[in-house]
């Protein structure tokens, strides 16, 4: 049975031009974690896999950082990367965790973050 | 320039283990995995897995579990992957790759090792 | 595991002829797709990943789309040294998993 339950970072906002930390937290079950894929709508961003590191795709290598830990720092934020983001948690024995993620890309200068993950 | 340069062809007996080696250069050895591919006579292309020169992580196709050891010597860039216990249908050619930067599809290929399991 | 089913598993065309092949993912794999040559004897070499980039050296004629679970890879314009054995890969989850390969022959 899934036991476990994904955090993530909720709605968050960030400024055209900054960056923002794309953060997930799978609690509440013993399973292991085998790797954590990152995805936009409709294309891969990243996999951290446990044993075989980092894979990121040829779009975002540019502009994506691995980490911090499991999470995805994305920078040189455009209007274009407003949408929706997942974390897939691959486990065993648990199978697939999923967190969404609603980022919106600001022109302005005030951006409020999420609650759960604070951004410095 | 990179290149995966493997050992020679192997004729083992059922039973036996084979070990197959990679020596690697023209780049930093640690800073890319190696992964390995076989292919049996008129066959297509199977995953064993994968490791990670420079934890020494490695990552298995269940298939081959408990059958496969993926380990690295830094010192001298080689990457090496021995199968036990083996089996006829173990006889194929055994492919060192490696991967793209911060890639896992696989960029570069050794030439392969013939392994003929036969008794 | 993932099944990636590919076709044709064979297909004869001319010179000069738009080839397409396909994959199919038994389940979503996103844009984690890789596609190989293989020519007989030889070791395979990476074409086209994620699923759309053309590798290093890689001709225009060759190409690659797709996203979720379909996948296309296409040769524009046959050339008779494109003869060759086509594979797709996935790398969405391991274990990785390859295609049954395309035989790419030439009228």
């Known amino acids: 049975m899934m036991t476990g339950t994904i955090e993530t970072t909720g709605n968050i906002s960030a400024e055209k031009g900054g960056s923002i930390i794309l953060q997930c937290h799978l609690s509440s079950t013993t399973a292991q974690v085998t790797q954590v894929n990152w995805e936009q709508q409709d294309q891969l961003l990243a996999i951290c896999n446990a044993d075989l590191g980092w894979h990121i795709s040829p779009s975002f290598k540019d502009r994506v950082a691995p980490g911090p830990g499991l999470g995805l720092t994305l920078q040189s934020l455009t209007v274009n990367d407003t949408g929706e983001y997942f974390c897939i948690y691959h486990t065993y024995p648990d199978g697939t965790y999923t967190g969404r993620i609603f980022l919106e890309v600001l022109e302005s200068s005030v951006a409020e973050h999420g609650a759960r993950f604070q951004i410095p | 320039q990179v290149q995966l340069v493997q050992s020679g062809a192997e004729v083992k007996k059922p039973g036996a283990s084979v070990k197959v080696s990679c020596k690697a250069s023209g780049y930093t050895f640690i800073s890319y995995n190696i992964y390995w591919v076989r292919q049996a006579p008129g066959q297509g292309l199977e995953w064993m897995g994968g490791?990670?020169?420079?934890?020494?992580?490695?990552n298995f196709n269940e298939n081959f579990q408990g059958r496969v050891t993926m380990t690295v010597d830094t010192s001298i860039s080689t990457a090496y992957m021995e199968l036990s216990r083996l089996r006829s249908d173990d006889t194929a050619v055994y492919y060192c790759?490696?991967?793209?930067?911060?890639?896992?599809?696989?960029?570069?290929w050794g030439q392969g090792t013939t392994v003929t399991v036969s008794s | 595991d993932i099944q990636m089913t590919q076709s044709p598993s064979s297909l004869s065309a001319s010179v000069g002829d738009r080839v397409t092949i396909t994959c199919k993912a038994s389940?979503?794999?996103?844009?984690?797709v890789a596609w190989y040559q293989q020519k007989p004897g030889k070791a395979p070499k990476l074409l086209i990943y994620s699923p759309s980039y053309r590798y290093t050296g890689v001709p225009s004629r060759f190409s690659g789309s797709g996203s979720g679970t379909d996948f296309t890879f296409t040769i524009s314009s046959l050339q008779p040294e494109d003869i060759a054995t086509y594979y797709c890969?996935?790398?969405?989850?391991?274990?990785?998993?390859f295609g049954g390969g395309t035989k790419l022959e030439i009228k």
């Open positions: 890969q996935q790398h969405y989850s391991t274990p990785w998993t």
């Open positions: 490791v990670n020169p420079s934890n020494g992580n490695t």
């Open positions: 790759t490696r991967g793209n930067y911060y890639g896992y599809e696989f960029a570069y």
């Open positions: 389940q979503h794999v996103s844009t984690a």
